[in-house]
C-alpha cells in the first residue's frame, strides 16, 4: 500500500475478536488508495539554471578558481534551496558565429576542465542534485543555431548528446529553438537519444515564444519534452489574465507534465516589479509542473540595480563584497548572506516553498482546480487523494480586497472547508498556523496566501 499520511487508529482487542491490529481510517472508510503516478526526479521539485558560471561564481575575490570548481563549492547552498536539478551553461567551446570553432564535446577553458566537470558531477550526485547541460550551440553569437548550417549543427548535437550521456549528465537543455529550422523533428530525434539511454534522463527545450499555438506545435510530437517559454510573461501581471493563461495552457496540453517559468533564461526581475516577486514564487512552486528558476531569482537579483552589470548575466550577490566597485551599491538585504539571516526575506520564502513543494503529495502530483475569486485574484486548490490539501490565493492587484472565493466552481472531490490553516503569507504580519475563515478572507495588495486543510470524506 502506498504510504499516504493517513490518520492511524488503534482498534481494541474486543473490536477485533482478540487480535490487536493497526487499521487506518481509510480502511474503515473503505475507498481504496488512489494509485500513485510514476514520478521522475524533475517532477519532485524545482530546477535551477546557471546560464553564466562566471557570474554565478562572482568575480573579484572569487575569480581565480575555475568556475566549474567554484560551483562545486556552492552545492551545499543549492541543497539548502532543495532544488532537484541544476541546468548548467552552455560551457562548451564556441567561437562566436563560427561553426568550425564550436565544439560541443569540449569545455571552454574559461569555465574549467573536463576533470573539473567530472568532479562536479560526482559531488552533485552525492547530494542528489541532477546536472542538466545546456548544449545551445552558438551561445555567444547572433543566431544560436547558425541558421545556414542546420544539418551540420544537428549532427554535432547528436554526437554531443551521446558523449555527455556517457559522461554521466542527467539531461540537456537547448534554447532559442524558434531559430532552429524543423525544430520539432530534431527535438524528437534528440529526445529519442536521451530517453533511449535512460527514461531517467531529461530534455528541456527553450523558446522565446509566448504564442500558445507555436508552443503546442513544439510539444505535439514530443510527449515528454519539458518546454520553457515566455508564455507566462505575457500576463501583464494581472490575476485574471494569469489565471486564463494557466488554465488555457493546462487544458490545451491535456494536463501533461509541464514546466513553469517566465522565460527560457532570464531572471524574474527582468519581467516583474519587486513587489510581485514573492507572489510569483508562491505561484510557480504551487502550480502543477516543474518550477524553473534562474540563479538569483531566490534573492530577487536585479541587474538594473547593479550599475555596469550585463542584464543577461549579473553577478550573483553572495555578500556585500560581491559587487565591490561601487561601495554602498549592495546592501546586506540584497545578498544571500543577508537574506539567509532574515526569516522574512525572499530567500527564506523560496526555501520554505521549495521544501513544501518537494515533500507534500498534493503539491508533488496533486490535481489542480482553479476557481473564481475577487477581481485581480487568482485562486486554486491542489489535492491528492486523502492527503493534506492546499489552497492558494494570489492578489496581483495594487489594492487590498476580499477574497470572494466562489467554491461553487469546484468539483465535489475538491470542496472548500469553512476554515483553513495559514501555512504562509508573502507579506509579514499574519500569524502562521492560525485558522482563517475563508468566507471572510481579505488579502493585502500583492499578497499571496498558502493555506492548508485536511481531506474530509
Amino acid at each position: 500500500h502506498h504510504h499516504h499520511h493517513h490518520e492511524q487508529k488503534l482498534i481494541s482487542e474486543e473490536d477485533l475478536g482478540g487480535e490487536q491490529k493497526l487499521i487506518s481510517e481509510e480502511d474503515l472508510r473503505a475507498p481504496r488508495c488512489r494509485e500513485l503516478p510514476a514520478q521522475k526526479w524533475w517532477h519532485t521539485g524545482a530546477l535551477y539554471r546557471i546560464g553564466d558560471l562566471q557570474a554565478f561564481q562572482g568575480h573579484g575575490a572569487g575569480n581565480l578558481a575555475a568556475p566549474i570548481s567554484g560551483l562545486k563549492g556552492r552545492l551545499d547552498y543549492l541543497s539548502s534551496l532543495k532544488v532537484k536539478g541544476l541546468v548548467l551553461g552552455p560551457i562548451h567551446k564556441n567561437q562566436k558565429d563560427d561553426v568550425a570553432q564550436t565544439d560541443l564535446l569540449q569545455i571552454d577553458p574559461n569555465f574549467g576542465s573536463k576533470e573539473d566537470f567530472d568532479s562536479l558531477l560526482q559531488s552533485a550526485k552525492k547530494k542528489s542534485i541532477r546536472v542538466i547541460l545546456d548544449l545551445t550551440p552558438n551561445y555567444r553569437g547572433e543566431n544560436s543555431w547558425f541558421s545556414t548550417q542546420v544539418d551540420t549543427v544537428a549532427t554535432k548535437v547528436k554526437d554531443a548528446l551521446e558523449f555527455w550521456l556517457q559522461a554521466g549528465v542527467d539531461g540537456f537543455q537547448v534554447r532559442d529553438i524558434e531559430n532552429l529550422k524543423d525544430a520539432s523533428s530534431f527535438l524528437a530525434e534528440w529526445q529519442n537519444i536521451t530517453k533511449g539511454f535512460s527514461e531517467d534522463r531529461l530534455l528541456i527545450a527553450g523558446t522565446n515564444s509566448s504564442d500558445l499555438q507555436q508552443i503546442l506545435s513544439l510539444l505535439e510530437s514530443n510527449k515528454d519534452l519539458l518546454l520553457t517559454s515566455s508564455y507566462l510573461s505575457d500576463s501583464g501581471s494581472t490575476g485574471e489574465h494569469t489565471k486564463s493563461l494557466v488554465t488555457q495552457y493546462l487544458n490545451a496540453t491535456g494536463n501533461r507534465w509541464c514546466s513553469w517559468s517566465l522565460s527560457q533564461a532570464r531572471l524574474l526581475t527582468s519581467f516583474l516589479p519587486a513587489q510581485l516577486l514573492r507572489l510569483y514564487q508562491l505561484m510557480l512552486f504551487t502550480l502543477p509542473g516543474t518550477p524553473v528558476f534562474s540563479y538569483g531569482d531566490e534573492i530577487g537579483l536585479d541587474a538594473a540595480a547593479l550599475p555596469g552589470q550585463p542584464m543577461e548575466a549579473p553577478v550573483m550577490l553572495w555578500d556585500e563584497s560581491s559587487f565591490p566597485d561601487i561601495p554602498g551599491a549592495v546592501s546586506a538585504n540584497m545578498t544571500v548572506k543577508g537574506q539567509s539571516e532574515d526569516p522574512g526575506s525572499l530567500l527564506s520564502l523560496f526555501r520554505r516553498l521549495s521544501d513544501q513543494r518537494s515533500k507534500e503529495r498534493s503539491l508533488l502530483h496533486g490535481d489542480f482546480h482553479a476557481f473564481s475569486a475577487g477581481p485581480g485574484l487568482f485562486s486554486y486548490i491542489r489535492h491528492w487523494d486523502q492527503n493534506e490539501r492546499f489552497l492558494v490565493v494570489l492578489n496581483f492587484g495594487d489594492v487590498g480586497l476580499s477574497a470572494g472565493l466562489q467554491a461553487s466552481d469546484l468539483p465535489a472531490s475538491a470542496s472548500l472547508p469553512a476554515k483553513a490553516d495559514l501555512l504562509l503569507s508573502t507579506q509579514p504580519g499574519r500569524e502562521e498556523g492560525s485558522p482563517l475563515e475563508l468566507e471572510r478572507l481579505k488579502l493585502e495588495p500583492h499578497e499571496g496566501l498558502l493555506l492548508r486543510f485536511p481531506y474530509a470524506a
Partner: antibody
Framework: QVQLVQSGAEVKRPGASVKVSCKAS????????IHWLRQAPGQGLEWMGW????????NYIQKFQGRVTMTRDTSISTAYMDLSRLRSDDTAVFYC??????????????????WGQGTLVTVSS | EIVLTQSPGTLSLSPGERATLSCRAS???????LAWYQQKPGQAPRLLIY???SRATGIPDRFSGSGSGTDFTLTISRLEPEDFAVYYC?????????FGQGTKVEIK
C-alpha cells in the same frame, strides 16, 4: 575612483626584511584579490602572487615561497607584502595591483587594470 | 609555467608609422586571458588590451590586439609621440601569471 596607494621607498641591508603597504580606496576592499608584482631595474615584470582580502587566503609563486608573506588589515583597507632575507638581487620596484571586471562577448574577463604607483626597495650593504 | 617570448626586443620607428609587436607562448593560452600593457619610465604599467583583442576603458582605437592559441599581436596603427614606451604581454589564464620580457618602441 579606484586608487591603490603604496608606501614610500625603502633602503635595506642584505638579510633584513621589508614590509610594503598598499592602501585601497574607491571600492569595497574585500571584493577583489590584491596581486603583488615586482620589477628589477631595467627588467620585465614578475608576478609574485595574491591575497584574498576577504578570507586572508594567499597564493605565492614557488620562487618566493618561504620568503614572502602577504597580509591585510580590512579595517583600514590595506594589504601588506613582507619579503624577508633580502639579497641584493631583490632590489626592485614592487607593485600592488587589482583586476577590473570586463564583460565582453559573453565572457567575464579579469585583467590587472588598477596599479599602485610602485615602491622602490633598494637592498645594499 | 607558460613562457611568453616577445619580439622584437626593440622597435625603432617614427611617429605616424605602424608598429607591430609579437608575443609567442610556450603553450596554448586561452585568448580570453591575454593582455597587453604599456609602461613608461618611472610609471606603473597601464592596461591597453585584455582578452587578446578588447580595448580597455579609455584606450584609443589606434591600439588593437589579435591572435589566438600561441601567437598574439599588438598593433599601433599610427604612432603618436606618447606611444613610445615598453610594451608587455601577459597571460592570466593559468597560474602562475606570466609576462613577456617586453618590447621597447623607441623613436627612430
Amino acid at each position: 575612483q579606484v586608487q591603490l596607494v603604496q608606501s614610500g621607498a625603502e633602503v635595506k641591508r642584505p638579510g633584513a626584511s621589508v614590509k610594503v603597504s598598499c592602501k585601497a580606496s574607491g571600492y569595497i576592499f574585500t571584493g577583489y584579490y590584491i596581486h603583488w608584482l615586482r620589477q628589477a631595474p631595467g627588467q620585465g615584470l614578475e608576478w609574485m602572487g595574491w591575497i584574498n582580502p576577504n578570507s586572508g587566503d594567499t597564493n605565492y609563486i614557488q620562487k618566493f615561497q618561504g620568503r614572502v608573506t602577504m597580509t591585510r588589515d580590512t579595517s583600514i583597507s590595506t594589504a601588506y607584502m613582507d619579503l624577508s632575507r633580502l639579497r641584493s638581487d631583490d632590489t626592485a620596484v614592487f607593485y600592488c595591483a587589482r583586476i577590473q571586471v570586463y564583460y565582453d562577448g559573453g565572457i567575464y574577463n579579469y585583467p590587472l587594470h588598477h596599479w599602485g604607483q610602485g615602491t622602490l626597495v633598494t637592498v645594499s650593504s | 609555467e607558460i613562457v611568453l617570448t616577445q619580439s622584437p626586443g626593440t622597435l625603432s620607428l617614427s611617429p605616424g608609422e605602424r608598429a607591430t609587436l609579437s608575443c609567442r607562448a610556450s603553450q596554448s593560452v586561452s585568448s580570453s586571458y591575454l593582455a597587453w600593457y604599456q609602461q613608461k619610465p618611472g610609471q606603473a604599467p597601464r592596461l591597453l588590451i585584455y582578452g587578446a583583442s578588447s580595448r580597455a576603458t579609455g584606450i584609443p582605437d589606434r591600439f588593437s590586439g589579435s591572435g589566438s592559441g600561441t601567437d598574439f599581436t599588438l598593433t599601433i596603427s599610427r604612432l603618436e609621440p606618447e606611444d613610445f614606451a615598453v610594451y608587455y604581454c601577459q597571460q592570466y589564464g593559468s597560474s602562475p601569471w606570466t609576462f613577456g620580457q617586453g618590447t621597447k618602441v623607441e623613436i627612430k
